[in-house]
């Protein structure tokens, strides 16, 4: 059987809405012929299932297999290296994967002006693997929240923050002209889930924009 | 807006160490992980080394491993490349990113922030 091979130091999940992605690190003195093996264990089964014999890639894309996350109980993972007829223990996933496990995220943010406000809608994830009706407002059917953050441009850094509780929000601009940039980052009051901020969009806003009243 | 700013490039000999820094700075800051990626003169930008922001986890390139040390600092919002035995092919621009995308941290296409680079060259 000769040397034992190390198991893979970490395995985790990073998540998004419909996007699973299972990661480990490699071992230490991987040879070129080393690839790794990985195994699914959905709470409830309890029986582990095998998802890829020999993957040479450090993730795997467990999306297609976990469809049913956000009506189950979730999942652990397992990976273990192979090399040959040689093959290490076992590294589990030291936190159940849930939908407590996946990062919160908005699919793009619209800014319009309309007489001195910003006006911005926020539009929801919409991922292709999604089942057609598993949406983002139903899987999250209440509390949903965004923080907004709003920069001035010129003046970087000043920064002005503000918690809506719709995807439709307004900013008002004091009257003040300029680049405005504005990014989302979406949670769930009732939840603990992380959120990603928002790619930055900015719009001008320019005099012609503000009505004048007598 | 997320800003990252790299620091502590220079011109070193053979053999020698660096130490890049990079800050990332900005009130909506939030990553799965930071890498370090570099492009040499003429050539495309390739990985060199990866962490997890939250956790244990980190990568690195073949032709680094072991002489490269890839660390951070949470608090401050800060990654680290500590670079020793440096080789002429070393020299390069070295970029700090940050991975906004749950794929692989090996893979350009996974980080959504980008610093300006700082450069590195190995000469006698």
């Known amino acids: 059987h000769g040397t034992e091979l190390p198991s893979p130091p970490s395995v985790w999940f990073e998540a998004e809405f419909f996007h699973h992605i299972l990661h480990w690190t490699p071992i230490p003195n991987q040879s070129e012929s080393t690839c790794y093996e990985v195994a699914l264990l959905r709470y409830g089964i309890e029986s582990w299932n095998s998802i890829s014999n020999c993957s040479q890639t450090l993730s795997y894309d467990l999306t297609a297999v976990t469809l049913d996350l956000y009506h189950s109980n979730g999942y652990r993972a397992r990976v273990r290296a192979v090399d040959g007829s040689r093959h290490s223990n076992w590294t589990v996933t030291n936190t159940r994967f849930s939908v407590d496990e996946v990062t919160l995220t908005v699919g793009s943010v619209n800014l319009e002006i309309h007489n001195g406000f910003i006006l911005g809608k926020i539009q929801l994830p919409r991922p292709k693997m999604a089942p057609a009706n598993d949406t983002y407002e139903s899987i999250f059917s209440h509390f949903r929240e965004y923080e907004i953050a709003i920069r001035k441009v010129p003046g970087n850094f000043t920064f002005t923050h503000k918690k809506v509780k719709h995807e439709n929000f307004s900013l008002l601009t004091s009257g003040e002209v300029g680049e405005f940039c504005v990014q989302v980052k979406p949670s769930v009051a009732s939840r603990s889930n992380k959120g990603m901020w928002s790619k930055e969009e900015c719009i001008s806003l320019t005099r012609q924009y503000f009505t004048v009243t007598n | 807006q997320l800003q990252l700013l790299e620091s502590g490039g220079g011109l070193v000999q053979p053999g020698g160490s660096l130490r890049l820094s990079c800050a990332a700075s900005g009130r909506t800051f939030s990553a799965y992980g930071m890498g370090w990626f570099r492009q040499a003169p003429g050539k495309g930008r390739e990985f060199v080394s990866a962490?997890?922001?939250?956790?244990?986890?980190?990568y690195y390139a073949e032709s680094v491993k072991g002489r490269f040390t890839i660390s951070k600092d949470n608090s401050k919002n800060t990654l680290y490349l500590q670079m020793n035995s440096l080789r002429a092919e070393d020299t390069a621009v070295y970029y700090c990113?940050?991975?906004?995308?749950?794929?692989?941290?090996?893979?350009?296409?996974?980080?959504?922030?980008w610093g300006q680079g700082t450069m590195v060259t190995v000469s006698s």
């Open positions: 990113a940050a991975k906004t995308r749950p794929d692989s941290y090996l893979s350009e296409k996974s980080y959504g922030y």
């Open positions: 962490i997890r922001w939250y956790g244990e986890g980190t």
